[in-house]
């Protein structure tokens, strides 16, 4: 294209710039060791240091290892990005008992209130269940099987103790486990038809939460009430709905009483790393560049295998998008790339403040 020559020539005399034919303009040449943040950098601020995979550029311009979520009790909340660490959180049904930078140093299962106590606040990702003494005369809120019996006067304090510190919380102490009989009963009751005789007029014996009021006679609406932005999972636990607050996510289905909010990648992006009810990493949708497709697998599996697409086929894409928009990601199995879990490193049990970097090297952790 001879008409491009004048533009190209303007770059030649300037060693700090080069001509990019694809975008037909002069671009700033990033110095050695720095990499462009966009296709055609225009100024020095468009260049940055490139860190190794699983490292991010911290505020002091140092490459720092992203935390790993390789412990059994952790899940990835946000992925490792060029300028921010991976963030881990406790997996559903657990709460963070000791926080750590971008992670949690210890998760515990939400507790069930013992006999004579009822749920005051359900457990969240940050806090354990908070229990309070059951008030006498109220229909039993069976937080445990013993609560379904008429309480003996010695087991339930009549007055709540005055806390010495306003910040304290009486958290309960019996962990919820998904496989308990009560939890299964809770889940089955939630799916029963409202007119089912076994669900009518029965006090809830769900672990963890009591109805907000005793069940009205003949009413099937006796389900546990979770806080806003929480849903009742299959084990009868109040579990935080996922958040779609990341820029690359949009809400697909809202947070309901018995199901989580689900998120999907915003239009023009596709899910590269799936997560429960969401996507851990969205990438720009390829314009017919993909040569591989994912082989659908059981979602519970950690790794996704890749195979070449059948001859003569291409993944859904638009070679010449008319409106400039690509279809949004719908299913995690459409992912083009799936990050496999960071390999589990050997534990370094120690009393020193140590965390494991993704490379297996111990790094000092503020805890």
């Amino acid at each position: 294209f001879p008409q491009d020559r004048p533009f190209e020539d303007t770059c030649h005399g300037n060693p700090s710039h080069y001509y990019d034919k694809a975008v037909r303009r002069c671009c700033y040449r990033c110095p050695m060791g720095l990499f462009p943040t966009q296709q055609c950098p225009q100024r020095p601020t468009d260049c940055r240091k490139q860190c190794e995979p699983d490292y991010y550029l911290d505020e002091a311009d140092r490459c720092t290892a992203c935390v790993t979520c390789s412990r059994d009790d952790l899940v990835e909340k946000t992925p490792c990005a060029w300028n921010s660490s991976r963030v881990c959180e406790c997996r559903p049904g657990m709460f963070c008992s000791t926080s750590a930078v971008n992670s949690c140093a210890r998760c515990f299962f939400h507790s069930v209130c013992p006999a004579g106590m009822i749920v005051k606040f359900p457990g969240t990702a940050q806090k354990n269940t908070v229990c309070e003494p059951a008030s006498p005369g109220v229909s039993p809120a069976c937080a445990s099987p013993e609560n379904c019996k008429e309480p003996s006067s010695g087991t339930i304090p009549q007055a709540k103790p005055t806390p010495v510190s306003p910040a304290t919380s009486s958290a309960s102490t019996m962990p919820v486990r998904g496989g308990t009989r009560l939890a299964q009963e809770a889940a089955s009751k939630l799916t029963r038809a409202p007119d089912s005789p076994s669900s009518v007029g029965r006090p809830s014996s769900d672990p963890g939460l009591s109805p907000t009021q005793p069940c009205p006679e003949g009413s099937g609406d006796c389900r546990k009430q979770c806080e806003p932005d929480y849903y009742l999972d299959e084990a009868g636990r109040c579990t935080a709905c996922v958040s779609c607050s990341r820029d690359d996510l949009v809400e697909k289905t809202p947070c309901a009483w018995n199901s989580s909010r689900t998120c999907e990648c915003r239009p023009g992006m596709i899910c590269a790393t799936s997560a429960t009810n969401s996507c851990a990493r969205c990438v720009p949708y390829p314009i017919c560049a993909a040569e591989t497709v994912t082989k659908p697998q059981d979602m519970a599996e950690k790794d996704t295998t890749f195979e070449a697409p059948p001859l003569g086929t291409q993944p859904d894409c638009n070679p010449t998008p008319e409106n400039g928009e690509a279809p949004a990601s719908t299913s995690p199995t459409q992912s083009l790339l799936v990050d496999s879990q960071a390999s589990k490193t050997l534990p370094i049990p120690t009393s020193a403040p140590v965390a494991l970097s993704s490379t297996g090297k111990p790094v000092l952790d503020a805890g």
Partner: antibody, heavy 125, light 111 residues
Framework: EVKLVESGGGLVQPGGSLRLSCATS????????MNWVRQPPGKALEWLGF??????????EFSASVMGRFTISRDDSQSILYLQMNTLRAEDSATYYC????????????????WGQGTSVTVSS | DIVLTQSPASLAVSLGQRATISCRAS??????????MHWYQQKAGQPPKLLIH???NLESGVPARFSGSGSGTDFTLNIHPVEEEDASTYYC?????????FGSGTKLEIK
């Protein structure tokens, strides 16, 4: 030198209340999780509960045997830990220990590395 | 709650010999390669002293004759060679979940 000294024990009637204190020195109290553990005469140790540090919201956890009756609080400015015991029963008679827990491991492993000498509580009419 | 069963309740060991104390949990206290079991020594009239954390990690200042092992539900404290000053009651404690619990204790006598 790390020191933990419990006080406030004594004789109390069933249904009564008592507040135990644990004065500490020799370490940065505000950084630590703090536990209460008791031991009835000639019997085993029983964990009662702990209070987290400021970074973790000063929240507490309790064993089922004392939940709703006992509360734990702390005063970081004075480096003192408290155990408020209400609705006391005969079975609460024991030596009460405070113990610190360093939340520095990742994972935090919840072990008690320093203990006080204990204070004796007797619940009897 | 997780119940910790210690055995034997008491044992007498000759000076210089090996003492082995067992602690069995009613369910696993291990996760992600970490074993949330700790061992304490309590001498008569004194508070407990932490000997071992995370099943096998010796606390600083604790003699190397103390060692711990185990994972899942079965844990062991070994003392070898036993010395006179080791006459104490030993307790295991788990922190695998809330609430934490202690074992019933093992009293060690030196013959």
């Amino acid at each position: 030198e790390v020191k933990l000294v419990e006080s406030g024990g004594g004789l109390v009637q069933p249904g009564g209340s008592l507040r135990l204190s644990c004065a500490t020195s020799g370490f940065t109290f505000s950084d630590y999780y703090m536990n209460w553990v008791r031991q009835p005469p000639g019997k085993a140790l029983e964990w009662l509960g702990f209070i987290r540090n400021k970074a973790n919201g000063y929240t507490t956890e309790f064993s089922a045997s004392v939940m709703g009756r006992f509360t734990i609080s702390r005063d970081d400015s004075q480096s003192i830990l408290y155990l408020q015991m209400n609705t006391l029963r005969a079975e609460d008679s024991a030596t009460y220990y405070c113990a610190r827990d360093p939340p520095y491991g990742n994972p935090h492993y919840y072990a008690m590395d320093y203990w006080g000498q204990g204070t004796s509580v007797t619940v009897s009419s | 709650d997780i119940v910790l069963t210690q055995s034997p309740a008491s044992l007498a060991v000759s000076l210089g010999q090996r003492a082995t104390i067992s602690c069995r949990a009613s369910k696993s206290v291990s996760a992600s390669g970490y074993n949330y079991m700790h061992w304490y020594q309590q001498k008569a009239g004194q508070p407990p002293k932490l000997l071992i954390h995370l099943a096998s990690n010796l606390e600083s200042g604790v003699p190397a004759r103390f060692s711990g092992s185990g994972s899942g539900t079965d844990f062991t404290l070994n003392i070898h060679p036993v010395e006179e000053e080791d006459a104490s009651t030993y307790y295991c404690q788990h922190s695998g979940e809330l609430p934490f619990t202690f074992g019933s204790g093992t009293k060690l006598e030196i013959k």
